[in-house]
């Protein structure tokens, strides 16, 4: 009955500080309302990076000031995190909640280790 959430183990952010990964969940029921949250875990401290609630069949929308964007297709969510820097390297956990109809289900992925390398500054040209 538990909800399983799958996500890649490792992702390398682009030189522009953008990382994308797929979060896939096995829904035990016919959910119509789903909430997806990206959490960052560092030294056993967990913080929320971003969250979005969406109706199945509709697009998922994060708040305007969010560093995340995403699209949904069935039980898959394609997540993109922007504005990452080397200090943001860490474990990013996908959390999925089936909010409606009852019962409520919680699903937590094992996390994606996102590596971010700050680009070298361009050398000055004479």
């Amino acid at each position: 009955k538990a909800m399983h959430v799958a996500q890649p183990a490792v992702v390398l952010a682009s030189s522009r500080g953008i990382a994308s990964f797929v979060c896939e969940y096995a829904s035990p029921g016919k959910a119509t309302e789903v909430r997806v949250t990206v959490l960052r875990q560092a030294d056993s401290q967990v913080t929320e990076v971003c969250a979005a609630t969406y109706m199945m069949g509709n697009e998922l929308t994060f708040l305007d000031d969010s560093i995340c964007t995403g699209t949904s297709s069935g039980n898959q969510v394609n997540l993109t995190i922007q504005g990452l820097r080397a200090m943001d390297t860490g474990l990013y956990i996908c959390k999925v909640e089936l909010m409606y109809p009852p019962p409520y289900y919680l699903g937590i992925g094992n996390g994606t280790q996102i590596y971010v390398i700050d680009p070298e500054p361009c050398p000055d040209s004479d």
């Epitope: 009955k1 538990a2 909800m3 919680l106």
Partner: antibody, heavy 118, light 108 residues
Framework: QVQLVESGGGVVQPGRSLRLSCAAS????????VHWVRQAPGKGLEWVSV????????FYADSVKGRFTISRDNSKNTLYLQMNSLRAEDTAVYFC???????????WGRGTMVTVSS | EIVLTQSPGTLSLSPGERATLSCRAS???????LAWYQQKPGQAPRLLIY???SRATGIPDRFSGSGSGTDFTLTISRLEPEDFAVYYC?????????FGPGTKVDIK
């Protein structure tokens, strides 16, 4: 610091109503689901209800469904439990608890006692 | 609903001894959604373990959790005087969230 403080308990007759409150502080209230859990005298813990985030999604134990209503006011950082048609078996200490980001109940209030007796 | 059963009901031990508490679920529970709480008389419960094996903030390392599927264990490696209390397991992966009936650890 992060804390939850319940209030509103008391002695009430069977069939009457009572409203409990839980004031939250020290964290972003709207980012968390919050629960009510109760404990009858000398007994174990019983989950009662949860309300998620913006307050649109609520879930209840069968024992209170149709009689209790959970709500929240995110602008006041406060959780509520409206208890109607109270029965003797509702006598318990009522705790509010925060559902952590990974799901377990990481912060608890000290509880408020509700006694239903004629 | 998922029913949790705890054993033994009471565990009588001396300080310094090892305590092993069991929690069994009526159906499979993902280890991601199994927690243990400690409660002392007149106090609120305190989260000890989440995700079956992760210690909550500030919990000493003498407390450890393990298990998967339907069988979970809380181990206290060396009982300290402050560890004598009631311990509850809980599943939080599906509503209704359920608690076990508790195991009381008392002084022998």
């Amino acid at each position: 610091q992060v804390q939850l403080v319940e209030s509103g308990g008391g002695v009430v007759q069977p069939g009457r109503s009572l409203r409990l409150s839980c004031a939250a502080s020290g964290f972003t209230f709207s980012s968390y689901g919050v629960h009510w859990v109760r404990q009858a005298p000398g007994k174990g813990l019983e989950w009662v209800s949860v309300i998620l985030y913006d307050g649109n999604n609520k879930f209840y134990a069968d024992s209170v469904k149709g009689r209790f209503t959970i709500s929240r006011d995110n602008s006041k950082n406060t959780l509520y439990l409206q208890m109607n048609s109270l029965r003797a078996e509702d006598t318990a200490v009522y705790f509010c608890a925060r559902g952590a980001l990974l799901g377990a109940f990481d912060i608890w209030g000290r509880g408020t006692m509700v006694t239903v007796s004629s | 609903e998922i029913v949790l059963t705890q054993s033994p009901g009471t565990l009588s031990l001396s300080p310094g001894e090892r305590a092993t508490l069991s929690c069994r679920a009526s159906q499979s529970v993902s280890s991601s959604y199994l927690a243990w709480y400690q409660q002392k008389p007149g106090q609120a419960p305190r989260l000890l373990i989440y995700g079956a094996s992760s210690r909550a903030t500030g919990i000493p390392d003498r407390f450890s959790g393990s298990g998967s599927g339907t069988d979970f264990t809380l181990t206290i490696s060396r009982l300290e005087p402050e560890d004598f209390a009631v311990y509850y397991c809980q599943q939080y992966g599906i509503s209704p969230f359920t608690f076990g009936p508790g195991t009381k650890v008392d002084i022998k």
